[in-house]
Interface confidence: low
C-alpha cells in the first residue's frame, strides 16, 4: 500500500491500477533552497544536481547533541518527497539544490536572496523548460524577499514555499506572505491542520492551500537506503511542488497564474477541520487539500476562479482594504464583509491599469476586508459600470449596456453610515438577467465583461426569515465569479465566495431584533464557456 | 561586533579619494525607508540589504555602493560590501555599523534598506 | 525511569504463533525508532526488525520477512512483534531496542525468551 | 549485507593492562555528506542485555569510563580498554548502522588473564 500522503493527493481514478506515470513531471526542473543533502541516497540518487551554491550563516556555537551533524536531514528528506524513487511526488522531475540553510537548519534573508538571484542568472545562461522554486524555509515578514520572489514569479518561474509552523498567521512570515509564492499549509492523515509541539501549521489569507505534512515517509540522511518520517510545513510544500511539476510535465506553457488556478480547482474542498484555527482566521483559510489533477492531460478551457481576501482594513473612520488579483488574472466581482457589520460597502476601481477591488470600513466598526474573485479569463475586455444612489423607492441600478457584454459581479458602495431597513424588489424584470440592483441610498457597480464564449447567469437564494447564512451555488459546470447580498442593509456583514459558493453573513439574529423586513438573499452570478471547442476555436 | 576582514582598511582608504567630492544629497523624490524584522531574535543587526530603484543598472548600484564607503570612511567608519544584486533586484548588501542607516537612506537610487534577518527550516 | 519492559515469551511449536510486547516508559515514545533484536542461546547479536518513530517505515532481516510483523501503538507506548509459522531456527532471547534515530541502540530491555520446539 | 567480523574471538588480559579488539566491516561504513562512521560498539555482561559504549566509531556513550574508546574510519575500526577492571568481563560486540539489515560482529570474548 501506498503511504498515506501519497494516495491522499492521487485521484481515485489512479488508485485502482498505479499511482501515478513512472515519468511524471520529466519536463520540469524543481531548485530546491534548504540544507545540504545526500544526493547519493538511492531515493534521489541521479535526479538531483547539487549546484555549488552556498549561503549559509555559521552554526551557533553552543555544543548539540549527537543529531545535530544530521546537516542533510532536512533538505534530503525533502528531495525525497519531491521526486523520489519510491516515496516521491513526480518521480521524473529533475532537481537542483542550492545550500542556504546551514545545520542547524538556519540561514538568512540575504543568503537566500543571493540564491534566488543565483537561480534567475542560471535561468538566463542557459533557459530550459519550466522552473519550479521550493523555499521550504520561512523568516519574518521580509519586504526584500517578497520582492526578489514577486521578480523571480514574473520572469516565469513557480515558486513554492511553507507557509511556517508558527501556528499563527502566515501573512506575518516570509517568504509565505508574497502574494506571487504559492502558500502551503500542512495537514495530516485524518485532514486536521498539523500540530507540531505546541505550535503547528500557519493559516490565513496568505495559504493558498494545504498539503499532507505529517508523519511523511521519505529519504533519510541515516544512510543512502534510510527512510524517515517528518513533519512540517515543508514536506507539504514539497507535495505541492511535486503536484505542480506533474502538472507543468504535462502543460508547459501554463503560467503561474493558470498553474495556481489548477492547483486550487484540483484541491480536496472541505475536508479541513476548521475548528483548529483561530476563529478569526476561519473565513480566511482556504479549505483546500492539494491533489493531482485526475488526468494529467490539460483541464481543456475551463472558467477557473478564486477567492482573494485583502488585509484588514484596520478600524479607523475611513480605511481602506484592496484586495488585488495577479496580473494574468481578471476581477470579475468585488464583495466586502465585516465582523461588526459596520461597513459602507465596497467598489471597484482601476489602480495602476488594473482593476482592484476596495472595501471601506464605517464609523465605529472594527474594519473590513475586501474580497476579490478573480478569474483566468483569456481576452477578455472588462469594464465597471457604475450608477449613483438612485434615491427611489425601486432602489438603484445599473446593467451591462454594451453588445457582448455580460455581468460577472455586482458591487454596492454608500457614503452615509447606515443604510435604512428600506427593501428593494429582490426580482429582477424578466429579460434583464444582465443588471445589478441594490439599495437607492448607495452607488451600485456592475462588472461587465466580453470574453469568447462566456456566458453568465444570476441564480438568487432569499430566506424571508432573517438566518446568519445564506447560501447559493452554481451547478456543475458553472463557476461562481460574482457574490453580493441583497438588500445592502447595514444587518448584513457581508458576502464571499467559498469555491463555488456564494455566502451572505448576517448579524446574530438573537441579539439585532431583526425583523422580516429584513430578509436576505444571496445572489450569485454563474458564468462558463458557452462551448469548450467554439471558444478554443475563438481563442485562435 | 569584531571583524576578521584585513583588508578593510585598504579597500576605504583606495575609494576615499576616489568618491569624496561626490555630493551627498538625495535625488529629488520620496525618502527611503529602513525595515527590519518585528521578530527581534530572528533580526541581524549589522548586516544591511540596501534596495534600489527598480530601472537602477549594476554600474549605478556599485557606484552606490562605493559612494556609501567613502561617505562612512570620511566619518571613521569601516563598511564592506557582501555582494551587489541584479538579475533580480538592484541592490547591494553591506556589513556596516546601525549609525550610518541615516546616511545610507539619503543616497541617490535608494528606494528601501532592510535589516539582515533570519530564516529557518520548516 | 527510563526502561523497556517485553514480554509474550515461551515455549511454541514449529509453525506456531506468538505475539511480543514492549512496554516503554521514561521517554517520548513517537519520537524514536525501535528495535527487535534477537540472541539465540550461547550465539551473538542479531537484528529482527525495525519501525519507524511514527509506525509509517518497516525494515525486516531477510531470516524473517513475510513471517514476522513489527508494529507499535503510540497511545499504550508500546512495541509489537507478531511472530508467524515459527522454526526451530527462531529459539532466541528476544530483545527490544530503543534506536537513537540513527540506527544504533541506546536503551535495550532485559529480554524475552522464545522457544520454537515440538 | 554488510558483514562485520571481529577479532580475536576471545582475549584474556591482567586487570590494569590494555585490552584491544577489533572489527572490520565489508564495506565503508563512513558516511561522506556528514564524515561519520556510522559503527558503535556494544558490552553485553553474563545474563544481562547489551550496552551501548561507543557510537559514530570514536563517541562514548554518556555514563561509560573514559577507560573506553574507540577509533577507526571506512572499514576497520578498534575499541580499547586503556586500563582493564574486574568489571569489565563481558562480551564486546560492534555494529554497523550505515544501512538496514543492521548487523554485528560475532562477539569478542574479553576475560581476565
Known amino acids: 500500500s501506498i503511504p498515506w500522503n501519497l494516495e491522499r493527493i492521487t485521484p481515485p481514478r489512479y488508485r485502482a491500477d498505479e499511482y501515478q506515470p513512472p515519468d511524471g513531471g520529466s519536463l520540469v526542473e524543481v531548485y530546491l533552497l534548504d540544507t545540504s543533502i545526500q544526493s547519493d541516497h538511492r531515493e534521489i540518487e541521479g535526479r538531483v544536481m547539487v549546484t555549488d551554491f552556498e549561503n549559509v550563516p555559521e552554526e551557533d556555537g553552543t555544543r548539540f547533541h549527537r543529531q545535530a551533524s544530521k546537516c542533510d536531514s532536512h533538505g534530503t528528506h525533502l528531495a525525497g518527497v519531491v521526486s523520489g524513487r519510491d516515496a516521491g511526488v513526480a518521480k521524473g522531475a529533475s532537481m537542483r539544490s542550492l545550500r542556504v540553510l546551514n545545520c542547524q537548519g538556519k540561514g538568512t534573508v540575504s543568503g537566500t536572496l543571493i540564491g534566488l538571484e543565483f537561480i534567475r542568472k542560471s535561468q538566463l545562461v542557459q533557459p530550459v523548460g519550466p522552473l519550479v522554486v521550493l523555499l521550504p524555509l520561512a523568516g519574518g515578514y521580509s519586504r526584500v524577499l517578497n520582492a526578489a520572489c514577486q521578480r523571480l514569479a514574473r520572469a516565469g518561474v513557480v515558486l513554492v514555499t511553507a507557509a511556517g509552523n508558527f501556528r499563527d498567521d502566515a501573512c506575518l512570515y516570509s517568504p509565505a506572505s508574497a502574494p506571487e509564492v504559492i502558500t502551503v499549509g500542512a495537514t495530516n492523515a485524518q485532514d486536521q491542520p498539523v500540530t507540531l509541539g505546541t505550535l503547528g501549521t500557519n493559516f490565513g489569507r496568505c495559504v493558498d492551500l494545504f498539503a499532507p505534512g505529517e508523519d511523511i515517509i521519505g529519504a533519510s540522511s541515516d544512510c543512502s537506503t534510510c527512510f524517515v518520517s517528518q513533519s512540517g510545513t515543508s514536506q507539504a510544500a514539497a507535495h505541492v511542488a511535486g503536484i505542480a511539476a506533474m502538472m507543468l510535465s504535462a502543460e508547459p506553457e501554463l503560467t503561474l497564474a493558470e498553474l495556481r488556478q489548477r492547483l486550487i480547482h484540483f484541491s480536496a474542498k472541505d475536508v479541513i477541520n476548521e475548528a483548529w484555527f483561530p476563529e478569526d482566521q476561519r473565513v480566511l483559510t482556504p479549505n483546500l487539500v492539494a491533489a493531482l489533477p485526475p488526468s494529467t492531460h490539460g483541464a481543456g478551457w475551463q472558467l477557473f476562479c478564486r477567492t482573494v481576501w485583502s488585509a484588514h482594513s484596520g478600524p479607523t473612520r475611513m480605511a481602506t482594504a484592496i484586495a488585488r488579483c495577479a496580473p494574468d488574472e481578471e476581477l470579475l466581482s468585488c464583495s466586502s464583509f465585516s465582523r461588526s457589520g459596520k461597513r459602507r460597502g465596497e467598489r471597484m476601481e482601476a489602480q495602476g491599469g488594473k482593476l482592484v477591488c476596495r472595501a471601506h470600513n464605517a464609523f465605529g466598526g472594527e474594519g473590513v476586508y475586501a474580497i476579490a474573485r478573480c478569474c483566468l479569463l483569456p481576452q477578455a475586455n472588462c469594464s465597471v459600470h457604475t450608477a449613483p444612489p438612485a434615491e427611489a423607492s425601486m432602489g438603484t441600478r445599473v446593467h451591462c449596456h454594451q453588445q457582448g457584454h455580460v455581468l460577472t459581479g455586482c458591487s454596492s458602495h454608500w457614503e452615509v453610515e447606515d443604510l435604512g431597513t428600506h427593501k428593494p424588489p429582490v426580482l429582477r424584470p424578466r429579460g434583464q438577467p444582465n443588471q445589478c440592483v441594490g439599495h437607492r441610498e448607495a452607488s451600485i457597480h456592475a462588472s461587465c465583461c466580453h470574453a469568447p464564449g462566456l456566458e453568465c447567469k444570476v441564480k438568487e437564494h432569499g430566506i424571508p426569515a432573517p438566518q446568519e447564512q445564506v447560501t447559493v451555488a452554481c451547478e456543475e459546470g458553472w463557476t461562481l465569479t460574482g457574490c453580493s447580498a441583497l438588500p445592502g442593509t447595514s444587518h448584513v456583514l457581508g458576502a464571499y465566495a467559498v469555491d463555488n459558493t456564494c455566502v451572505v453573513r448576517s448579524r446574530d439574529v438573537s441579539t439585532t431584533g431583526s425583523t422580516s423586513e429584513e430578509a436576505v438573499t444571496a445572489v450569485a452570478i454563474c458564468c462558463r464557456s458557452r462551448h469548450l471547442a467554439q471558444a478554443s476555436q475563438e481563442l485562435q | 561586533q569584531e571583524d576578521e576582514d584585513g583588508d578593510y582598511e585598504e579597500l576605504v582608504l583606495a575609494l576615499r579619494s576616489e568618491e569624496d567630492g561626490l555630493a551627498e544629497a538625495p535625488e529629488h523624490g520620496t525618502t527611503a525607508t529602513f525595515h527590519r524584522c518585528a521578530k527581534d531574535p530572528w533580526r541581524l543587526p549589522g548586516t544591511y540589504v540596501v534596495v534600489l530603484k527598480e530601472e537602477t543598472h549594476l554600474s549605478q548600484s556599485e557606484r552606490t555602493a562605493r559612494r556609501l564607503q567613502a561617505q562612512a570612511a570620511r566619518r571613521g567608519y569601516l563598511t564592506k560590501i557582501l555582494h551587489v544584486f541584479h538579475g533580480l533586484l538592484p541592490g547591494f548588501l553591506v556589513k556596516m555599523s546601525g549609525d550610518l542607516l541615516e546616511l545610507a537612506l539619503k543616497l541617490p537610487h535608494v528606494d528601501y534598506i532592510e535589516e539582515d534577518s533570519s530564516v529557518f527550516a520548516q | 525511569e527510563v526502561q523497556l519492559v517485553e514480554s509474550g515469551g515461551g515455549l511454541v511449536q514449529p509453525g506456531g504463533s506468538l505475539r511480543l510486547s514492549c512496554a516503554a516508559s521514561?521517554?517520548?515514545?513517537?519520537?524514536?525508532?525501535m528495535n527487535w533484536v534477537r540472541q539465540a542461546p550461547g550465539k551473538g547479536l542479531d537484528w529482527v526488525s525495525t519501525?519507524?518513530?511514527?509506525?509509517?517505515?518497516?525494515n525486516y532481516a531477510d531470516s524473517v520477512k513475510g513471517r514476522f510483523i513489527i508494529s507499535r501503538d503510540s497511545s499504550k507506548h508500546t512495541l509489537y512483534l507478531q511472530m508467524n509459522s515459527l522454526r526451530a531456527e527462531d529459539t532466541a532471547v528476544y530483545y527490544c531496542?530503543?534506536?537513537?534515530?540513527?540506527?544504533?541502540?541506546?536503551?535495550w530491555g532485559r529480554g524475552t525468551l522464545v522457544t520454537v520446539s515440538s | 549485507d554488510i558483514v562485520m567480523t571481529q577479532s580475536p574471538d576471545s582475549l584474556a588480559v591482567s586487570l590494569g593492562e590494555r585490552a584491544t579488539i577489533n572489527c572490520k566491516s565489508s564495506?565503508?561504513?563512513?558516511?561522506?555528506?556528514?564524515?561519520?562512521?556510522?559503527l558503535g560498539w556494544y558490552q553485553q555482561k553474563p545474563g544481562q542485555p547489551p550496552n551501548l559504549l561507543i557510537y559514530?566509531?570514536?563517541t562514548r556513550e554518556s555514563g561509560v569510563p573514559d577507560r573506553f574508546s574507540g577509533s577507526g574510519s571506512g572499514t576497520d575500526f578498534t575499541l580499547t580498554i586503556s586500563s582493564l577492571q574486574a568489571e569489565d568481563v563481558a562480551v564486546y560486540y560492534c555494529?554497523?548502522?550505515?544501512?538496514?539489515?543492521?548487523?554485528f560482529g560475532q562477539g569478542t570474548k574479553l576475560e581476565i588473564k
Open positions: 519501525i519507524s518513530g511514527s509506525g509509517g517505515t518497516t
Open positions: 564495506q565503508s561504513v563512513l558516511y561522506r555528506s556528514n564524515n561519520r562512521n556510522f
Open positions: 521514561g521517554f517520548t515514545f513517537n519520537n524514536y525508532a
Open positions: 555494529q554497523q548502522y550505515y544501512t538496514t539489515p543492521y548487523t
Open positions: 531496542a530503543k534506536d537513537s534515530n540513527w540506527g544504533n541502540f541506546d536503551l
Open positions: 559514530w566509531a570514536s
